[in-house]
Amino acid sequence: MAVTACQGLGFVVSLIGIAGIIAATCMDQWSTQDLYNNPVTAVFNYQGLWRSCVRESSGFTECRGYFTLLGLPAMLQAVRALMIVGIVLGAIGLLVSIFALKCIRIGSMEDSAKANMTLTSGIMFIVSGLCAIAGVSVFANMLVTNFWMSTANMYTGMGGMVQTVQTRYTFGAALFVGWVAGGLTLIGGVMMCIACRGLAPEETNYKAVSYHASGHSVAYKPGGFKASTGFGSNTKNKKIYDGGARTEDEVQSYPSKHDYV
């Protein structure tokens, strides 16, 4: 029950996190015009990964996409890449984790298979979260570096525009959304990995047991237990001689496909 709860919670937390990463990536407010200790302007500038926007006092907002690819700073391209990789990995992780959920039965999928899928999705969520955190942190570092360098006529800005007005940019809402979302995805991934341990059938060390039946002295050697990878067939122990006795693995109860936790 605890394993199912951990897995379910990990899935939900990761789902929220990935939704947040997608939201952050799409948001325009990665950097916003610094209003502190600056003249009050009737124009407010803010920039995202894909476009820059200007909001006037009138409420009129104009956004312009970065239609150039080569003209953009390498750091911005790197941040874009990290966020997209994070989204892709997260999306695949979500897809895998849906099938891995213990509360959902697909055919006669073994718990060992679910355990492996849970681990896979967990690792994907962890990497996804790290990508988002890294992307946001790189952008934040870029802002801090540029903050004091924003002087008149300096060639800066995400769109590579000539600045004739000293416009300094500070952290936008998207950065905080990205950090939180990345953290949630990371936590969700860790929870999935923890749940995986509880799902995996533990490997049993079998010892040879001597059985005596009908006066015959026959030794029984149980076959080695092969743990399922989740993708191959689960090779069960084969009896050497069926003399009414059961090997240890045969008396273990396996959950049927109708057992729901």
Partner: antibody, heavy 118, light 113 residues
Framework: EVQLVESGGGLVQPGGSLRLSCAAS????????MHWVRQAPGKGLEWVSY????????YYADTVNGRFTISRDNAKNSLYLQMNSLRAEDTAVYYC???????????WGQGTLVTVSS | DIVMTQSPDSLAVSLGERATINCKSS????????????LTWYQQKPGQPPKLLIY???TRESGVPDRFSGSGSGTDFTLTISSLQAEDVAVYYC?????????FGGGTKVEIK
């Protein structure tokens, strides 16, 4: 047709108070920022105050800050300017103007004359 | 505060001739975000409220004759009336629409010579 009509002007003694009103019609008043601009007799234009569409931002000229208060009632399609501690130099025709993209004033009222004199 | 300096104070031009009014701001009115200059030109005739002519330094307001044009960037701007008509006799004001307070220039009176 967009119309802005100012009222409330008149003769007032120095130190006195006056409340100007601007009635708006012909457009969705609640969607536009509004300004007050004044013009002393025979002089140029002087910006006085601004209020955003949802009252979230309010700005004043240094010359009136602390004495004048801008407000609006979107339900009544009205803009107001409460003027306290009036001085002789506040004598002017007061215009209300609608803010539009480019932060320009596309429509102006006909103005109301405020005379501060003893 | 941003100081807007207009020149000349008054201008007498013959009908059909070109009239040029200059406006200089103490700080750049160019916004880096959209590369637009936040400067507006108004025309005021006697006894009337001002009328919007040009915004974003060079964009003509709808209904304004094409003989009116605006140019310039940063701190230096110009309003040009390519062929002065009798109805153009008025006072012209430039306005800073970038920094609060939104200051106006002193005005330029255009008359017919």
């Amino acid at each position: 047709e967009v119309q802005l009509v100012e009222s409330g002007g008149g003769l007032v003694q120095p130190g006195g108070s006056l409340r100007l009103s601007c009635a708006a019609s012909g457009f969705t008043f609640s969607s536009f920022g509004m300004h007050w601009v004044r013009q002393a007799p025979g002089k140029g234009l002087e910006w006085v105050s601004y209020i955003s569409s949802g009252n979230s931002a309010i700005y004043y000229a240094d010359t009136v800050n602390g004495r004048f208060t801008i407000s609006r009632d979107n339900a009544k399609n009205s803009l107001y300017l409460q003027m306290n501690s009036l001085r002789a130099e506040d004598t002017a025709v007061y215009y209300c103007a609608r803010l539009r993209y480019g932060n320009s004033f596309d429509y102006w009222g006909q103005g109301t004359l405020v005379t501060v004199s003893s | 505060d941003i100081v807007m300096t207009q020149s000349p104070d008054s201008l007498a031009v013959s009908l059909g001739e070109r009239a040029t009014i200059n406006c200089k701001s103490s700080q750049s009115l160019l916004n880096s975000g959209n590369q637009k200059n936040y400067l507006t030109w108004y025309q005021q005739k006697p006894g009337q409220p001002p009328k919007l002519l040009i915004y974003w330094a060079s964009t003509r307001e709808s209904g304004v004759p094409d003989r009116f044009s605006g140019s310039g960037s940063g701190t230096d701007f110009t309003l040009t009336i390519s062929s002065l008509q009798a109805e153009d006799v008025a006072v012209y004001y430039c306005q800073n629409n970038y920094y609060y307070p939104l200051t106006f220039g002193g005005g330029t009176k255009v008359e017919i010579k």
